[in-house]
């Protein structure tokens, strides 16, 4: 079965800067990736970025730069200040829509013990079957 992994990293240089990396471990063709925070998209979460493999990117503050890393993984840099700034216990979720598997979503946050500059290993987070 497909899996989604989520990795959250706080940058050592800026404590309000986070990098989220997400990947899809499956054989299908990805049609859309949605990154959200505060919970799964559509379940109280707020969309940070939407990435289409051909048509491009839409992103929303405090997202600074979303991009495809490979055909099956993306990264998103967040830079916030004040109310729009992520904090250490913020949950980030990535939802991959793929054919023929459907939609798969996983969430992750910064590990409690992480020092700035460290990150969680990119292991699959609990998988939520969306569709």
């Amino acid at each position: 079965t497909p899996e989604v992994w989520v990795q959250v990293r706080m940058e050592a240089t800026e404590l309000s800067s986070f990098t989220i990396r997400c990947g899809f471990l499956g054989s299908g063709s990805i049609s859309l990736v949605t990154v959200s925070w505060g919970g799964p998209n559509g379940a109280g979460g707020t969309t940070l970025a939407v990435l289409h493999p051909e048509r491009g990117i839409r992103q929303w503050a405090p997202a600074r730069q979303a991009r495809w890393e490979t055909q099956s993984s993306i990264s998103l840099i967040l830079e916030g200040s004040g109310a729009s700034s992520p904090c250490a216990n913020t949950t980030f979720c990535c939802k991959f829509a793929s054919f023929p598997e459907g939609s798969w979503e996983a969430c992750g946050s910064l590990p409690p013990s992480s020092d700035p500059g460290l990150s969680a290993p990119p292991t699959p987070a609990p998988i939520l079957r969306a569709d």
Partner: antibody
Framework: EVQLQQSGPELVKPGSSVKISCEAS????????VDWVKQSHGKSLEWIGA????????SYNQKFEGKATLTVDKSSTTAYMELRSLTSEDSAVYYC????????????WGTGTTVTVSS | DIVMTQSQKFMSTSVGDRVSITCKAS??????VDWYQQKPGQSPKTLIH???NRHTGVPDRFTGSGSGTDFTLTISNIQSEDLADYFC?????????FGGGTKLEVK
């Protein structure tokens, strides 16, 4: 008919601010994002930023952060862009445009607002 | 930032002719390119989205092609009303960027 009607021309002094509007009609405002584009005289187009009417979420071209502030009023189906600390470099025509989320493009453009900064 | 280069600033053509306007991206932007037409004193109008999809109501004389870094807008059977500036736009990455424009003159 789908329309984006923008406010009229503005003649403003250097250092001041201006707020221009983009009133949407003929469609469900919340179903589309509104982006803003600058066209300096005789020049090409520059993307300023976007706003999502549903939650007021914004995205800016870094070049315009601190210069432009995007807001919406859902009740009047109107998007606004405020430009601050104006200089002659800000003299331009500003357009709003409707972004189609499912198809990923601007399908309708506003009428344009000319801003002239002069003492 | 991704640079969109329209190397032809001006193009001259005659009614009934066919012309190709090109746009080159500084990096691979897949098919995330649109084409817009702007007639003198008017707002831009959408012609082509996602490199090759014609916008509703746009005559089939307008055709978009290309992917990756090289894109072309072809106008066949040129009409006098096609006198305009033509711009490409990439929305593959932030910030979105436009080409410098190509002004089409119809003799």
């Amino acid at each position: 008919e789908v329309q984006l009607q923008q406010s009229g021309p503005e003649l403003v002094k250097p250092g001041s601010s201006v707020k221009i509007s983009c009133e949407a009609s003929g469609f469900t405002f919340a179903d589309y994002n509104v982006d803003w584009v600058k066209q300096s005289h005789g020049k090409s187009l520059e993307w300023i930023g976007a706003i999502n009417p549903n939650d007021g979420g914004t995205s800016y071209n870094q070049k315009f952060e601190g210069k432009a502030t995007l807001t919406v009023d859902k009740s009047s189906t109107t998007a606004y862009m405020e430009l601050r600390s104006l200089t002659s470099e800000d003299s331009a025509v500003y357009y709003c445009a409707r972004w189609v989320n499912n198809d990923w493009y601007f399908d309708v453009w506003g009428t344009g607002t000319t801003v002239t900064v002069s003492s | 930032d991704i640079v969109m280069t329209q190397s032809q600033k001006f193009m001259s053509t005659s009614v009934g002719d066919r012309v190709s306007i090109t746009c080159k991206a500084s990096q691979n932007v897949r098919s995330a390119v649109d084409w817009y037409q702007q007639k003198p004193g008017q707002s831009p109008k959408t012609l082509i989205h996602s490199a090759s999809n014609r916008h509703t109501g746009v005559p089939d004389r307008f055709t978009g092609s290309g992917s990756g870094t090289d894109f072309t807008l072809t106008i066949s059977n040129i009409q006098s009303e096609d006198l305009a500036d033509y711009f490409c736009l990439q929305h593959w990455n932030y910030p979105y960027t436009f080409g410098g424009g190509t002004k089409l003159e119809v003799k």
